[in-house]
């Protein structure tokens, strides 16, 4: 590794450092598909952006391998807990990789939000936040799933979101 | 961009990298003003610090433009949910910018913590955590608001806090 | 600081930047000791890793001083709230330092998860997430404690975890 090589490497690193991969995707009316697939996200409007990461059908797609802090928050809410809706909500971040046929659980939370309804009000709100560092290879994808997604409240992109940045 | 220029830029970057902007502000007795304004924070004592960011009247003020992971946690608690105190709590991070007259919602959570009181105990505790990546320009500010702030419990700076770092 | 020195420093920084300290530790069957000590963690299998940080008896041990974003999530769950179990759960990140005999609270949450049980189901789930930036010196340690740890549900390492990265 001669001086010129090192120099090029440093210049290269400076440029790549300027675009340390990061993304923040926001909830939108189209986020809940009801198809059993992952949540879909807004990637450009408002607070949403992609920098050094790409997006495909609900997934953040890694272009540069490394350790990433990935996170998601979902806003949950309802009026009582209708029969047929699970009283346990599962909110998770999952990895898709060409090396395995099935999604791999990365970070998961289970909550029982309906217990938040009070005797004077059947309306309840709850929020679930997940965040943690995982290693992701180029081409791997991360998605968000919520079961039962009918309890996710979207509104304006500030209450339910999904993001990542390289650490 | 000659070698000397690149060299200066790299030296500069090394120095700026040493002070990657970061801050962690903690809750204090003076945090809750009751004035309808944002929460106020401790910036120096104990675990609190500012590095490459400044503070003004509850706001983290950006000095270097870029993408920041901003976060806040508030500890909520009470004895029952007295009438007139909102049974829905809204905890949010908001941006102030010279370009708009009103605050802009960045990250928001709604919770119904009073439902956590049980038949055997009217005492309840709940916690709300928010975190996400947003782009901030130099001079823009981020504040934390909680409605109803009377449900926020402060104590010692470890339970309610507000921070950010550049990614 | 001559050109050669600066060059060495930059090379050094590039190498150290490649190993920006980070870790993600996951919950395992052995995590809950019942001894009154901190939770123990998996450091190698599955999603767990250590990079530029070490581990000792439940603690992340800092090798390079600096500001770190530290985080932990614990999955809580139960069937009702048995008598003798505190209805308030405390989940916290604590620092151990050679300079003080006692652990120092860094980030703490209190929750009353049992209130999430509903009239139709005594089963409840809840999750507690903590994250924030703290300054850590080389040799200092961070641990996770949950009181009462009997309400922590482990399963597969995705629901309860502990991590950090330098910012």
């Amino acid at each position: 590794d001669g001086p010129a090589g090192s120099w090029e490497q440093l210049i290269q690193e400076r440029r790549s450092h300027e675009v340390n991969p990061a993304a923040h995707l926001t909830g939108a009316n189209s986020s809940l598909t009801g198809s059993g697939g992952p949540l879909l996200w807004e990637t450009q409007l408002g607070l949403a952006f992609l920098r050094g990461l790409s997006y495909h059908d609900g997934a953040l797609v890694v272009t540069k391998a490394g350790y990433y802090y990935i996170y998601s928050k979902v806003q949950l809410g309802g009026v009582g807990c209708p029969l047929g809706l699970a009283s346990t909500i599962t909110h998770g971040l999952y990895k898709r990789t060409p090396r395995y046929p099935e999604e791999l659980e990365l970070l998961v939370s289970q909550q029982s939000p309906c217990g938040r309804a009070t005797s004077s009000s059947r309306v309840w709100w709850d929020s679930s936040f997940l965040g943690g560092v995982v290693h992701l290879e180029a081409g791997e994808e991360v998605v968000v799933r919520v079961l039962d997604e009918r309890l996710v409240r979207l509104r304006d992109g500030t209450r339910s979101y999904f993001g990542a940045f390289m650490v | 961009d000659g070698p000397a220029g690149s060299w200066e830029q790299l030296i500069q970057e090394r120095r700026s990298h040493e002070v990657n902007p970061a801050a962690h502000l903690t809750g204090a007795n003076s945090s809750l003003t009751g004035s309808g304004g944002p929460l106020l924070w401790e910036t120096q004592l104990g675990l609190a610090f500012l590095r490459g960011l400044s503070y003004h009247d509850g706001a983290l003020v950006v000095t270097k433009a870029g993408y920041y992971y901003i976060y806040s946690k508030v500890q909520l608690g009470g004895v029952g949910c007295p009438l007139g105190l909102a049974s829905t709590i809204t905890h949010g991070l908001y941006k102030r910018t010279p370009r708009y007259p009103e605050e802009l919602e960045l990250l928001v959570s709604q919770q119904s913590p009073c439902g956590r009181a049980t038949s055997s105990s009217r005492v309840w505790w709940d916690s709300s955590f928010l975190g996400g990546v947003v782009h901030l320009e130099a001079g823009e500010e981020v504040v934390v608001r909680v409605l109803d702030e009377r449900l926020v419990r402060l104590r010692d700076g470890t339970r309610s806090y507000f921070g950010a770092f550049m990614v | 600081d001559g050109p050669a020195g600066s060059w060495e420093q930059l090379i050094q920084e590039r190498r150290s930047h490649e190993v920006n300290p980070a870790a993600h530790l996951t919950g395992a069957n052995s995590s809950l000791t019942g001894s009154g000590g901190p939770l123990l963690w998996e450091t190698q299998l599955g999603l767990a890793f250590l990079r530029g940080l070490s581990y000792h008896d439940g603690a992340l041990v800092v090798t390079k001083a600096g500001y770190y974003y530290i985080y932990s999530k614990v999955q809580l769950g139960g069937v009702g709230c048995p008598l003798g179990l505190a209805s308030t759960i405390t989940h916290g990140l604590y620092k151990r330092t050679p300079r003080y005999p006692e652990e120092l609270e860094l980030l703490v949450s209190q929750q009353s998860p049992c209130g999430r049980a509903t009239s139709s189901s005594r089963v409840w789930w809840d999750s507690s997430f903590l994250g924030g930036v703290v300054h850590l010196e080389a040799g200092e340690e961070v641990v996770v404690r949950v009181l009462d740890e009997r309400l922590v549900r482990l399963r597969d390492g995705t629901r309860s975890y502990f991590g950090a990265f330098m910012v």
Partner: antibody, heavy 121, light 111 residues
Framework: QVQLVQSGAEVKKPGASVKVSCKAS????????VHWVRQAPGQGLEWIGA????????SYNQKFKGRATLTADKSTSTVYMELSSLRSEDTAVYYC??????????????WGQGTLVTVSS | EIVLTQSPATLSVSPGERATLSCKAS??????????MNWYQQKPGQPPRLLIY???NLESGIPARFSGSGSGTEFTLTISSLQSEDFAVYYC?????????FGQGTKLEIK
């Protein structure tokens, strides 16, 4: 300044109902609870319940639930307490009081002048 | 419900002297460092007047000779130097649990 002005004394027969009013002024009516407390002659104070004028929510002492009804009229900044199925032991001075909060701890920082309700056959 | 017991029922003190009134709760009224106990003064023919809220906070406009202390189940109202206008009945009241309850009162009379 904050003022709570109550309606005048009432004499009622057992089994009847009484409705006492409390007109608020000097503060934002919809931002504070109004509580009702009674005091039998020569006795101590007893909490009846409270109403939140902002949305009409109420909270009652179980002892009075079903007999006491608390309501608020935002248009006139007036709160009402109706007590039905009156008995002689309901003879008391009835006070309205504004409820303030320190965190979730409530206290009564302004009181009406009181309304004497006499139940006698 | 939480029962509040005040003692003594009657307290005779001379003007200028210190008066100490006690209130005991049947269970703790503490939460997170706050005690949900309040004190009121009532004179004949008048409504009660708030003196102290949350055990030790002096209500605006109340003279500094009044102070409150205590936690858990035991609380005290102290009047450091009695003035003639202080002779009245004093009630403690808890707001920890519905129904809110009052003590039976302590009558402070001139000795």
């Amino acid at each position: 300044q904050v003022q709570l002005v109550q309606s005048g004394a009432e004499v009622k027969k057992p089994g009847a109902s009484v409705k006492v009013s409390c007109k608020a002024s000097g503060y934002t009516f919809t931002s504070y609870n109004v509580h009702w407390v009674r005091q039998a002659p020569g006795q101590g104070l007893e909490w009846i319940g409270a109403v939140y004028p902002g949305n009409g929510d109420t909270s009652y002492n179980q002892k009075f639930k079903g007999r006491a009804t608390l309501t608020a009229d935002k248009s006139t900044s007036t709160v009402y307490m109706e007590l039905s199925s009156l008995r002689s032991e309901d003879t008391a001075v009835y006070y309205c009081a504004r409820g303030s909060y320190y965190y979730t701890s409530s206290y009564f920082d302004h009181w009406g002048q009181g309304t004497l309700v006499t139940v006698s056959s | 419900e939480i029962v509040l017991t005040q003692s003594p029922a009657t307290l005779s003190v001379s003007p200028g002297e210190r008066a100490t009134l006690s209130c005991k709760a049947s269970q703790s009224v503490d939460f997170d460092g706050d005690s949900y106990m309040n004190w009121y003064q009532q004179k004949p023919g008048q409504p009660p007047r708030l003196l102290i809220y949350t055990a030790s906070n002096l209500e605006s406009g109340i003279p500094a000779r009044f102070s409150g202390s205590g936690s858990g189940t035991e609380f005290t109202l102290t009047i450091s130097s009695l003035q003639s206008e202080d002779f009245a009945v004093y009630y403690c009241q808890q707001s920890y649990e519905d129904p809110f309850t009052f003590g039976q009162g302590t009558k402070l009379e001139i000795k």
